[in-house]
């Protein structure tokens, strides 16, 4: 999906209002210095591309993020403010259904969510630079 035509201001507002709080809740008990950020993003479409991929692509080390509250809200936000996004997400929905039902938060999932927080912060910073 090409995120170029999204309403970035609306996505930022949704992130600050709800998604960020859910991410921080997920990370509760860990310090921001516990994990090194190894990925970043350069502009707003890039940030959303990587956020989407990291949130919904299961990895061998962390297969369950797609069922988390922040992931559901991320999906809803992108569907609302990115024209045509929801039509491209049939496969992602299948991936969410296949994701493990276990609610165990592994260290690797915490690390992945830490990377997500970094990508979202970079998204916000690129918005501030443009304004």
């Amino acid at each position: 999906y090409d995120f170029t035509n999204c309403d970035f201001q609306k996505i930022e507002a949704d992130y600050l209002r709800t998604i960020s709080k859910d991410l921080i809740t997920y990370m509760s008990g860990t310090k921001s210095t516990d994990f090194n950020n190894t990925v970043s993003c350069s502009n707003r479409p890039h940030c959303l591309t990587e956020i989407q991929s990291l949130t919904f692509n299961p990895t061998p080390r962390c297969a369950s993020l797609a069922k988390e509250m922040f992931a559901r809200k991320t999906k809803a936000t992108l569907a609302l403010w990115c024209p045509g996004y929801s039509e491209t997400q049939i496969n992602a929905t299948q991936a969410m259904k296949k994701a493990r039902k276990s609610k165990v938060t592994t260290n690797k999932c915490l690390e992945q969510v830490s990377q997500l927080l970094g990508l979202w912060r970079r998204f916000i910073r690129t918005l501030l630079k443009k304004q």
Epitope: N36, N37, V39, S42, E50, T59
Partner: antibody
Framework: QVQLQESGPGLVKPSETLSLTCTVS?????????WSWIRQPPGKGLEWIGY???????SYNPSLKSRVTISVDTSKNQFSLKLSSVTAADTAVYYC??????????WGQGTLVTVSS | EIVMTQSPATLSLSPGERATLSCRAS??????LAWYQQKPGQAPRLLIY???SRATGIPARFSGSGSGTDFTLTISSLEPEDFAVYYC??????????FGQGTKVEIK
């Protein structure tokens, strides 16, 4: 400390597919970062080809996108480049590199690929 | 695509002198700029990222500055091992990261 090593044929015929592999040691490629390919024609500057992130997102240089495939084999801690329909203009030193998806902090030593019949 | 133009093409200096290398972007890249050093027969090495942050293990004599379209790499006092080709790279314009054509720093 992470080390990267490119391997593959040094000579490819025009119209064929160039295939290179990068073996990573000292770091698990499924643990973090992105894994990138960059090339440098003899005596010229650098050109970014593309990357694959540890979680599977892939990005290619638009000028090469129709001909490029980057894939990963986590069991061997390797990632690969395929460039189809090559011409003499694809003759270059090909580097693999670790990236945070923005810049490139660790590089292989490079391998020269010549396209010639 | 954003075109990165480096000047001069060649810089002839003596050890101990100050080197000032320029990189100009065809449009603003904010501070999304890196500098690399490449010696003959070797891979490039990251020196500077985010326009002014030194990469791990890079000596303090290397410094970067600038924002928007004009950037500078300064080597405060050239050591013999600093004679090499230097490239800038913009990473503002994903998915089209581009490098400058390079500046060669040679011994005078």
């Amino acid at each position: 400390q992470v080390q990267l090593q490119e391997s593959g044929p040094g000579l490819v015929k025009p119209s064929e597919t160039l295939s290179l592999t990068c073996t990573v040691s000292g770091y698990s490629i499924s643990s973090g970062y992105g894994w990138s390919w960059i090339r440098q024609p003899p005596g010229k500057g650098l050109e970014w080809i593309g990357y694959i992130s540890y979680y599977g997102s892939i990005s290619y240089n638009p000028s090469l996108k129709s001909r490029v495939t980057i894939s990963v084999d986590t069991s061997k801690n390797q990632f690969s480049l395929k460039l189809s329909s090559v011409t003499a203009a694809d003759t270059a030193v090909y580097y693999c590199a670790r990236t945070n998806l923005l810049y490139f902090d660790s590089w292989g030593q490079g391998t020269l690929v010549t396209v010639s019949s | 695509e954003i075109v990165m133009t480096q000047s001069p093409a060649t810089l002839s200096l003596s050890p101990g002198e100050r080197a000032t290398l320029s990189c100009r972007a065809s449009q603003s890249v904010s501070n999304n700029l890196a500098w690399y050093q490449q010696k003959p027969g070797q891979a490039p090495r990251l020196l500077i990222y985010d326009a002014s942050s030194r990469a791990t293990g890079i000596p303090a004599r290397f410094s970067g500055s600038g924002s928007g379209t004009d950037f500078t790499l300064t080597i405060s006092s050239l050591e013999p091992e600093d004679f090499a080709v230097y490239y800038c790279q913009q990473y503002s314009d994903w998915p089209q990261y581009t490098f400058g054509q390079g500046t060669k720093v040679e011994i005078k």
